[in-house]
């Protein structure tokens, strides 16, 4: 671990209460193949415990979608992940739309410091799905 | 290559007869800028031979596709990556729909284990693209 | 340095004049989150200083846009990220269109030599949005 | 095994329309197109139009305002419809499919509708 | 549209001998890494049957001896060794867009 391997990959355990657009994370061996290796989970949301540049993941599929649903019928969907705490650190790092697809899914290079905690806002009328291998998110420290 | 630096890059060489929906994938420096450092093919589909956890990635583009040969026109089009083999360890790691686009992409962060055999199943009634630069599949050992 | 730890993550600075279809980048902690770790810029385009393995990844959000600015209002928009020079390499490594989304994000495993110079064009009648968290640009040098 | 078995008429006077029927068996028109083919002395082998999955229908452009197709799924059939005949439209009529893909290239095709169009 | 034009028109070969036929397209018939051409085989009364698609896939059942190739707009079928029931009109088609168009038809005979 000293070589600063720190790496994580989680899957979905729920959205968040009615105002909070947060997704909630959750990762172990237990649960399939997610898993935590150096960050850490609070409150369902994912720490860095370690400084470095990160490769930032993510996929997101929207449940019981159609391109239709996507569209016209529904408010416009984003993903954006994020910085959230501590506050004076606060930033989008990546925002993606859904438009008329069902799953956006992407990846950046990105400085993260100890004790920044990563938010995953999800806004719109329609829920993630919670199948592993449709929606998840990661890190991966690439450098020092 | 004892530091565990498996990765390869993988081109499409053809789809499966009738019944099989995998994709058939082939690499090497003859083919272009396609390799294979450590994992291996056997008929086609790409095998595991160091545990640890990968970085796995594709993209797939559909043959002389628009959106509305996604949409409504045509079978819904799914790509899944998993592992098919051994059947023990048989799991759906990755899976995207098209819907109204022609390209999916993404990529995810799973432990592996020697012997795994990956495979790509393209379901629907289109074609995937068989330029090098539209249609490729790859993993990168990350750590152990 | 010496581990060859090359790692480049760009913002869009601008995008070319009439004819040239090349969106131009910078990079550097003064501009936000990118930086250039080994790579360099060379009037907005990213040149390689190392051989090896590399992991290219970009993502692209067009500014102002819905899913019907990109299906009939609009001539087809396509990225295609490239080895522009030397121009013995020159090569589409990863190319993807547009559709009816607004935006792309991919990644893929190529191999780059020192002096390879990395253009990434734009086509289509859309402006690509200058928000670092819609669209970004990077690489990291993953093995020899 | 797949089949298209096609039904239809023989002679038909000039300026009448023309109506094919193609039952399917072994597949699902919710998941596959049926295209329309007719070869003449004249023409040759010549492509008309196509009906997709989900009803909608791509035509053979120099034909469009004469063509018309439409479909049955639960009871596995295409139809065929063809206004204003000449006698240059004097074919044998073919509804065909593709194995596997949407793409436009048949192994399967029905017997073929004569169709004679004469005064 | 893409015109496809087939030569010769007619050829007699000899059994046992190799007959080959050549298919010409107004404009490019390949895009995703496919070229777009196919052949068919049609006898008196029947239906076309399609003997190769993607320019060179053998359909199920299709004898060996028959084979194509070529790629942007020139394409060959080729039979060897030829056999008394190849004796048919064999016609290529492209599917790159629509519509898709066939070619004239080149009729094989047996000397």
């Known amino acids: 671990e000293s070589l600063g391997w720190d790496i994580a990959e989680l899957q979905l355990n729920h959205t968040g209460p009615q105002q909070d657009p947060r997704l909630y994370w959750q990762g172990g061996p237990a649960l399939g193949r997610s898993f935590l290796r150096g960050p850490e989970l609070d409150k369902g949301q994912l720490r860095i415990r370690r400084d470095g540049i990160y490769m930032v993941h993510i996929q997101v599929t929207l449940a019981i979608c159609s391109s239709t649903s996507t569209s016209r019928h529904h408010h416009p969907t984003t993903l954006a992940v994020g910085i959230c705490s501590p506050a004076s650190r606060s930033i989008s790092l990546l925002r993606l739309s859904f438009h008329q697809g069902c799953t956006i899914a992407s990846q950046r290079l990105t400085p993260l410091a100890r004790g920044d905690t990563l938010c995953t806002n999800l806004t719109g009328t329609l829920l993630p799905s919670r199948n592993t291998d449709e929606t998840f998110f990661g890190v991966q420290w690439v450098r020092p | 290559e004892s530091l565990g630096w498996d990765i390869a890059e993988l081109q499409l060489n053809h789809t499966g007869p009738q019944q099989d929906p995998r994709l058939y994938w082939q690499g090497g420096p003859a083919l272009g800028r396609s390799f294979l450092r450590g994992p291996e093919l056997d008929k086609g589909q790409l095998r595991i031979r160091r545990d640890g956890i990968y970085m796995v990635h594709i993209q797939v583009t559909l043959a002389i596709c628009s959106s509305t040969s996604t949409s409504r026109h045509h079978h819904p089009t799914t790509l899944a990556v998993g592992i098919c083999s051994p059947a023990s360890r048989s799991i759906s790691l990755l899976r995207l729909s098209f819907h109204q686009g022609c390209t999916i992409a993404s990529q995810r962060l799973t432990p592996l284990a020697r012997g795994d055999t990956l495979c790509t199943n393209l379901t629907g009634t289109l074609l995937p693209s068989r330029n090098t630069d539209e249609t490729f599949f790859g993993v990168q050992w990350v750590r152990p | 340095e010496s581990l060859g730890w090359d790692i480049a993550e760009l913002q869009l600075n601008h995008t070319g004049p009439q004819q040239d279809p090349r969106l131009y980048w910078q990079g550097g902690p003064a501009l936000g989150r990118s930086f250039l770790r080994g790579p360099e810029l060379d009037k907005g385009q990213l040149r390689i200083r190392r051989d090896g393995i590399y992991m290219v990844h970009i993502q692209v959000t067009l500014a102002i846009c819905s899913s019907t600015s990109t299906s009939r209002h609009h001539h087809p928009t396509t990225l295609a990220v490239g080895i522009c020079s030397p121009a013995s390499r020159s090569i589409s490594l990863l190319r993807l269109s547009f559709h009816q989304g607004c935006t792309i994000a991919s990644q893929r495993l190529t191999p780059l030599a020192r002096g390879d110079t990395l253009c990434t064009n734009l086509t289509g009648t859309l402006l690509p949005s200058r928000n670092t968290d819609e669209t970004f640009f990077g690489v990291q040098w993953v093995r020899p | 095994q797949v089949q298209l078995k096609q039904s239809g008429p023989g002679p038909v006077q000039p300026s009448q329309s023309l109506s094919i029927t193609c039952t399917v068996s072994d597949f699902s028109l919710t998941i596959f197109g049926i295209h329309w083919v007719r070869q003449s002395p004249g023409k040759g082998l010549e492509w008309l139009g196509v009906i997709w999955r989900d009803g909608s229908t791509d035509y053979n452009v120099a034909l469009m305002s004469r063509l018309n197709i439409t479909k049955d799924n639960s009871k596995s059939q295409v139809f065929f419809k063809m206004n204003s005949l000449q006698t240059d439209d004097t074919a044998i009529y073919y509804c065909a499919k593709n194995r596997r893909y949407d793409y436009a290239w048949f192994p399967y095709w029905g017997q073929g509708t004569l169709v004679s169009v004469s005064a | 549209d893409i015109v496809l034009t087939q030569s010769p028109a007619s050829l007699a070969v000899s059994l046992g001998q190799r007959a080959t036929i050549s298919c010409r397209a107004s404009?490019?018939?390949?895009?995703?890494?496919?070229?777009?051409l196919h052949w068919y085989q049609q006898k008196p009364g029947q239906p076309p049957k399609l003997l190769i698609y993607?320019?060179?896939n053998l359909e199920s059942g299709v004898p060996a001896r028959f084979s194509g190739s070529g790629s942007g707009t020139d394409f060959t079928l080729n039979i060897h060794p030829v056999e008394e029931e190849d004796a048919a009109t064999y016609y290529c088609?492209?599917?790159?867009?629509?519509?898709?168009?066939f070619g004239a038809g080149t009729k094989l005979e047996l000397k």
């Open positions: 993607l320019t060179s």
């Open positions: 088609q492209h599917s790159r867009d629509f519509p898709p168009t």
């Open positions: 404009k490019s018939v390949s895009a995703s890494g496919y070229s777009f």
